[in-house]
C-alpha cells in the first residue's frame, strides 16, 4: 500500500513538476526590466528564451522572436538546450512511469519489470528536474552578471551632456517557476526511486526449514511467518499481510518482501 | 466616433478648488487611459499625469502631485481632475487625451480644452 | 525630468517649401527592447487642442499627410513637411513619450512670409 502511495505520489509530483518546466521554458518573463532606483519609463521590457517584448503604459504589448540562431549568446542556447532536455527526459519519464505503476495492469507484467521501469522514470525525473534547476540558475547567473556591469554602467555620458540610460534586468516570474518545478521533478523522481526500492522483488526463496526441539514439535519459519504448534488443527503455514491470509500452497510466484506491508 | 467632452470655462477666487470634467463617447472607456495636460496662456504644454478608469491607477507629474488630483467614473464613461489651493499660476486651459493603443504611449483624442481663470 | 529642447522657435516660410524642424532630449528615447524611439510630434492651431502626427519618432497617424515626415533616433529627432502648405501654419511639439513624467518642448511655430 505504501509503495503505491509513494509511487503514485512520485507520479503525481512529477507531471506538476514537468508542467511547470515547460510552463517555464514557454514564459516570456526570464527577465524583467529593473524598475528599482531607476528612472521610470512608459513602457516595460522583458525577455524570455524565444523572445522579447516590450509592454507600453497601454497595455499594447509586443513581442519579437530571437529569429537567429548563431547570433545568440551561447548562454542562451544552452539554457535552452538544457530546458528542453529536461522536458524531454521528463516527458519520457511520464510515459514510462504511467505503465509502472501498480495501479495500473497491464496485461501479466512482472513486478520485476515495474520496478525496473519506476527506478528508469525516477532517474530521468531526477536528471530532468537537474537540467530545468541548472538552466535556470545559468539564467539567474547571468543576469546577475549583467545586472552588476550595467549598474556600473547605468548612464554613458555622451560628450557630458546627453545621458543614455541602460536598462537593466531582474529575475522574472519564469526563473522562480522554473527552479520550483524543477525542484517538483527531483522530489518526485526521488520518490519513484523509493517505490522502486518497494516493488523490487526479493531473491530469498522462502522455504520452511524445520527445528526439532526437545519438547513438543514447534516449526520456526523465517521471513515474517507465525510459528505454529503442532497441537491445534491449525497445520498449514499462514503468512500475515494486510489482506487476510493465503497459504504457502497458494502462492504461486515469490512474492516481494515488501508486497504486503 | 471618439470623443472627449470637457466642462465649460471656470472662474474661482485664489484658495477656492476646482472640479473639472471631461466625458468619453465613441469608445470603451475603462480600456484606454485619459491624460490631463496643463497649457499657459501663451505658454507650452505640461502634462499632469494619467488615470487608467479600469484599475483607477493614477500617475502624477510630482509638481503637480498635491495640486491634482483624478477620478474617474466607468458608469458615465467620464474622467475628473480636481485642482486645489488656486493660485494665479493655475489660470490655464485644461486638456484631457486619451492614450492611444499602440501608439507609442501617444495621444491621439483629446478634449477641446477648459479654460481655468483665478482671479480675485 | 526630461528636457526637450526644440530649435527654432519659430520659422517664417512660404508655401511649397519644404521645412526641417529639430528637436533633441537631455536622455536617449531609444527603446532597446523593441528598438523604438519614444518620441511624438503634435500639431497644435490656434484656439485648437493638439492634434496627434508623429509617434514612434517617425510612425504617421492615420489620417496625416504624407508631407508630414519624421526621423532621428537616441536624442536628436526631425520632423519634416516636404511641402508646406497654407493650413500647416501651427506650433509644432515634441514630446517625450518614454520617461515619466512625460515632458514636451517649448513648440515650434511656424508663420507665413
Known amino acids: 500500500m505504501a509503495v503505491t502511495a509513494c509511487q503514485g505520489l512520485g507520479f503525481v509530483v512529477s507531471l506538476i513538476g514537468i508542467a511547470g518546466i515547460i510552463a517555464a521554458t514557454c514564459m516570456d518573463q526570464w527577465s524583467t526590466q529593473d524598475l528599482y532606483n531607476n528612472p521610470v519609463t512608459a513602457v516595460f521590457n522583458y525577455q524570455g528564451l524565444w523572445r522579447s517584448c516590450v509592454r507600453e503604459s497601454s497595455g499594447f504589448t509586443e513581442c519579437r522572436g530571437y529569429f537567429t540562431l548563431l547570433g545568440l549568446p551561447a548562454m542562451l542556447q544552452a539554457v535552452r538546450a538544457l530546458m528542453i532536455v529536461g522536458i524531454v527526459l521528463g516527458a519520457i519519464g511520464l510515459l514510462v512511469s504511467i505503465f509502472a505503476l501498480k495501479c495500473i495492469r497491464i496485461g501479466s507484467m512482472e513486478d520485476s519489470a515495474k520496478a525496473n521501469m519506476t527506478l528508469t522514470s525516477g532517474i530521468m525525473f531526477i536528471v530532468s528536474g537537474l537540467c530545468a534547476i541548472a538552466g535556470v540558475s545559468v539564467f539567474a547567473n547571468m543576469l546577475v552578471t549583467n545586472f552588476w556591469m550595467s549598474t556600473a554602467n547605468m548612464y554613458t555620458g555622451m560628450g557630458g551632456m546627453v545621458q543614455t540610460v541602460q536598462t537593466r534586468y531582474t529575475f522574472g516570474a519564469a526563473l522562480f517557476v522554473g527552479w520550483v518545478a524543477g525542484g517538483l521533478t527531483l522530489i518526485g523522481g526521488v520518490m519513484m526511486c523509493i517505490a522502486c526500492r518497494g516493488l523490487a522483488p526479493e531473491e530469498t526463496n522462502y522455504k520452511a526449514v524445520s527445528y526439532h526441539a526437545s519438547g513438543h514439535s514447534v516449526a520456526y519459519k523465517p521471513g515474517g511467518f507465525k510459528a505454529s504448534t503442532g497441537f491445534g488443527s491449525n497445520t498449514k503455514n499462514k503468512k500475515i499481510y494486510d489482506g487476510g491470509a493465503r497459504t504457502e500452497d497458494e502462492v504461486q510466484s515469490y512474492p516481494s518482501k515488501h508486497d504486503y506491508v | 466616433q471618439v470623443q472627449l467632452q470637457q466642462s465649460g470655462a471656470e472662474l474661482a477666487r485664489p484658495g477656492a478648488s476646482v472640479k473639472m470634467s471631461c466625458k468619453a463617447s465613441?469608445?470603451?472607456?475603462?480600456?484606454?487611459?485619459i491624460h490631463w495636460l496643463k497649457q499657459g496662456p501663451g505658454q507650452g504644454l505640461e502634462w499632469i499625469g494619467y488615470i487608467n478608469p479600469s484599475t483607477i491607477y493614477t500617475n502624477y507629474n510630482q509638481k503637480f502631485k498635491y495640486k491634482a488630483t483624478l477620478t474617474a467614473d466607468k458608469s458615465s464613461s467620464t474622467a475628473y481632475i480636481q485642482l486645489s489651493s488656486l493660485t494665479s499660476d493655475d489660470s490655464a486651459v485644461y486638456y484631457c487625451?486619451?492614450?492611444?493603443?499602440?501608439?507609442?504611449?501617444?495621444?491621439?483624442?483629446w478634449g477641446q480644452g477648459t479654460s481655468v481663470t483665478v482671479s480675485s | 525630468d526630461i528636457v526637450m529642447t526644440q530649435s527654432p522657435s519659430s520659422q517664417t516660410v512660404t508655401a511649397g517649401e519644404k521645412v526641417t524642424l529639430s528637436c533633441r532630449s537631455s536622455?536617449?528615447?531609444?527603446?532597446?527592447?523593441?528598438?523604438?524611439?519614444?518620441l511624438t510630434w503634435y500639431q497644435q492651431k490656434p484656439g485648437q487642442p493638439p492634434k496627434l502626427l508623429i509617434y514612434w519618432a517617425s510612425t504617421r497617424e492615420s489620417g496625416v499627410p504624407d508631407r508630414f515626415t519624421g526621423s532621428g533616433s537616441g536624442t536628436y529627432f526631425t520632423f519634416t513637411i516636404s511641402s508646406v502648405q497654407a493650413e500647416d501654419l501651427a506650433v509644432y511639439y515634441c514630446q517625450n513619450a518614454y520617461f515619466y513624467p512625460f515632458t514636451f518642448g517649448a513648440g515650434t511655430k511656424l508663420e507665413l512670409k
Open positions: 465613441g469608445y470603451t472607456f475603462p480600456t484606454y487611459s
Open positions: 536622455q536617449s528615447l531609444l527603446n532597446g527592447g523593441n528598438q523604438k524611439n519614444y
Open positions: 487625451a486619451r492614450e492611444g493603443y499602440g501608439r507609442g504611449n501617444a495621444m491621439d483624442y
